[in-house]
């Protein structure tokens, strides 16, 4: 997590900065959304609890050919301690519920904003 912040980052990034940057990227996606995000692709819903960064990445990594969320996927990988590949699922997925990527991003954004406001970065 300390080395998150994008490829051009000059050095280690504090957890608070990394989380803030992820929030701001999700805001950008939400604000700039004109056509249905990722052509209306559906992803597995997740439980927004401990381990949610890996779970979020596992859901979003199954969306291919969607440039709008590529940066988010890269940023989430910085929060997840293990390598995530397509088709991988954790117990945090609500496996009977699929939602649109746009709703997934909106839900994740709200949850991360709450964590950030409360000063919970890890």
């Amino acid at each position: 997590l300390t080395c998150l912040g994008g490829f051009a980052s000059p050095g280690p990034v504090p957890p608070s900065t990394a989380l803030r940057e992820l929030i701001e990227e999700l805001v950008n996606i939400t604000q700039n959304q004109k056509a249905p995000l990722c052509n209306g692709s559906m992803v597995w819903s997740i439980n927004l609890t401990a381990g949610m960064y890996c779970a979020a990445l596992e859901s979003l990594i199954n969306v291919s050919g969607c440039s709008a969320i590529e940066k988010t996927q890269r940023m989430l990988s910085g929060f997840c301690p293990h390598k995530v590949s397509a088709g991988q699922f954790s117990s945090l997925h609500v496996r009977d519920t699929k939602i649109e990527v746009a709703q997934f991003v909106k839900d994740l954004l709200l949850h991360l904003k709450k964590l950030f406001r409360e000063g919970q970065f890890n």
């Epitope: 803030r20 929030i23 939400t30 709450k114």
Partner: antibody, heavy 119, light 107 residues
């Protein structure tokens, strides 16, 4: 047109519980957060707490033990309850809509406010 | 808590003057700062959010700048309707906090 309107008692006695209702129109409580702020006469603004769009709440830690915020989405209402009122709680109480689709929390629409006197 | 310190607490100015109000945060708040205008007996009105983004309908004579801990609200040419109290607010960390206000009075 976005509007918010606070309603409730203008006078409460010390130790009593204050209940204020914020009735909104022009937006959905499931899409926007509603914040509560107060302002003692002649003084600055103080944030009390928020009803998030998903129904969660967060509070100013100084007042957390005295505050509850609830909502009735069918009535487009958010309710603030503050227990054990004291004369220092005399203030104009505002509800406000949060800008929401932004990284920061700010207040883009406000109610007209209701002056609550504790005496 | 993040303390927000505004200066000056009051100022006297004339119509047409350029007015600058500063807001100092006790810690880094990135650009998570908003400015409000309040007139007596009225609710505050949002002028600027995210340091420099003008709220819809707000005249372009209002502008904001800064980053980190130091922020500025500028009114390029004061108009009669601008005499009011101005507050800054950080939207970075709970509890959300406001500055003590700057009262802009007629000279």
């Amino acid at each position: 047109q976005v509007t918010l309107k606070e309603s409730g008692p203008v006078l409460v006695k010390p130790t009593e519980t204050l209940t204020l209702t914020c009735t909104v129109s022009g937006f959905s409580l499931t899409n926007y957060h509603v914040q509560w702020i107060r302002q003692p006469p002649g003084k600055a603004l103080e944030w009390l707490g928020v009803m998030w769009s998903d129904g969660d709440t967060s509070f100013n830690s100084v007042l957390k033990s005295r505050l509850t915020i609830s909502r009735d989405t069918s009535k487009s209402q958010v309710v603030l309850t503050m227990t054990n009122m004291d004369p220092v709680d005399t203030a104009t109480y505002y509800c406000a809509r949060d800008g929401t689709i932004a990284a920061m929390d700010y207040f883009d629409y406000w109610g007209q406010g209701t002056l609550v006197t504790v005496s | 808590d993040i303390q927000m310190t505004q200066s000056p607490s009051s100022l006297s100015a004339s119509v047409g003057d350029r007015v600058t109000i500063t807001c100092l945060a006790s810690e880094d708040i990135s650009n998570y700062l908003a400015w409000y205008q309040q007139k007596p007996g009225k609710a505050p009105k949002l002028l600027i959010y995210h340091t420099s983004r003008l709220q819809d309908g707000v005249p372009s004579r209002f502008s904001g700048s800064g980053s980190g801990t130091d922020f500025t609200l500028t009114i390029s040419s004061l108009q009669p309707e601008d005499f009011a109290t101005y507050y800054c607010q950080q939207g970075y960390r709970f509890p959300l906090t406001f500055g003590g206000g700057t009262k802009v009075e007629i000279k």
